[in-house]
């Protein structure tokens, strides 16, 4: 015998109080599949969460985070604060990068400046809290007797510290 509730489409529920009639989901609730005996309460995006997609009778609301925060967890269950460039998020909030490290993003950790000398190169541009150093040609390439035909080796890509 077929379950009469299986005929109830998404956006409705099988109402046992009304002889298993398919009733529309009440306001602020939804059912995303057919044959449901109850509708689920819509997620409310409050506080630091903001609504990315409104709830409908067939799908839940979707939240993201207000400016200054970014989503974490499945379905943006948490909002984590952004930091400024030149900072990293610690357990006690945003802190400036220590000397010799940098972060060019609003997320993530401070990373060590590239050590140009490991590749036999010189520092062309000093690093800052926000930017990696830029490595220049090796000192040998700058000597008067060096061939002017051989171009200097490309600098290490910024943001990649040596392993």
């Amino acid at each position: 015998l077929q379950d009469p509730c299986s005929n109830c489409p998404a956006g409705t529920f099988c109402d046992n109080n009304r002889n298993q009639i398919c009733s529309p989901c009440p306001p602020n609730s939804f059912s995303s599949a057919g044959g449901q005996r109850t509708c689920d309460i819509c997620r409310q995006c409050k506080g630091v969460f903001r609504t990315r997609k409104e709830c409908s009778s067939t799908s839940n609301a979707e939240c993201d985070c207000t400016p200054g925060f970014h989503c974490l967890g499945a379905g943006c269950s948490m909002c984590e604060q952004d930091c400024k460039q030149g900072q990293e998020l610690t357990k006690k909030g945003c802190k400036d990068c220590c000397f010799g490290t940098f972060n060019d993003q609003k997320r993530g950790i401070c990373r060590p400046w590239t050590n140009c000398s490991l590749d036999g190169k010189s520092v062309l541009v000093n690093g800052t809290k926000e930017r990696d150093v830029v490595c220049g040609p090796s000192p040998a390439d700058l000597s008067p007797g060096a061939s002017s035909v051989t171009p200097p080796a490309p600098a290490r890509e910024p943001g990649h510290s040596p392993q």
Epitope: E88, L89, T90, K91, K92, K95, I109
Partner: nanobody
């Protein structure tokens, strides 16, 4: 699959107590530090407390020091947070999180897996 499942939240009056639990599975529990964080209604995530893999080292945010106690039972793969003298400002969704290393501190933000959270409401 690494999973963390919190429980123990609820409604409590100011001055009351609650004990949160976090059941872990899918990884060698004793090999990793664990952390509690919380998200108050109008704010971003706040770090609450961390404990090393062995349970020997614990760290607390200033706002909960002396009131909250973090502990773990490695034989049961469970993390705990005993919360006493609760205040209205402790109202939040509480999440347990796995850190990426065995040791921990009160600085490095090193969480890589999160639970789904349990709600704590402190109100009279």
């Amino acid at each position: 699959e690494v999973q963390l499942l919190e429980s123990g939240g609820g409604l409590v009056q100011p001055g009351g107590s609650l004990r949160l639990s976090c059941a872990a599975s899918g990884f060698t529990f004793s090999g990793y530090a664990m952390t509690w964080v919380r998200q108050p209604p109008e704010k971003g995530l706040e770090w609450v407390s961390s404990i090393s893999g062995s349970g020997n080292n614990t760290f607390y945010a200033d706002s909960v020091k002396g009131r909250f106690t973090i502990s773990r039972d490695n034989s049961k793969n469970t993390l705990y947070l005993q919360m006493n003298s609760l205040r209205a400002e402790d109202t939040a969704v509480y999440y347990c999180a796995k850190e990426g290393t065995t040791e921990t501190d009160d600085y490095h933000y090193n969480m890589d897996v999160w639970g789904q959270g349990t709600t704590v409401t402190v109100s009279s």
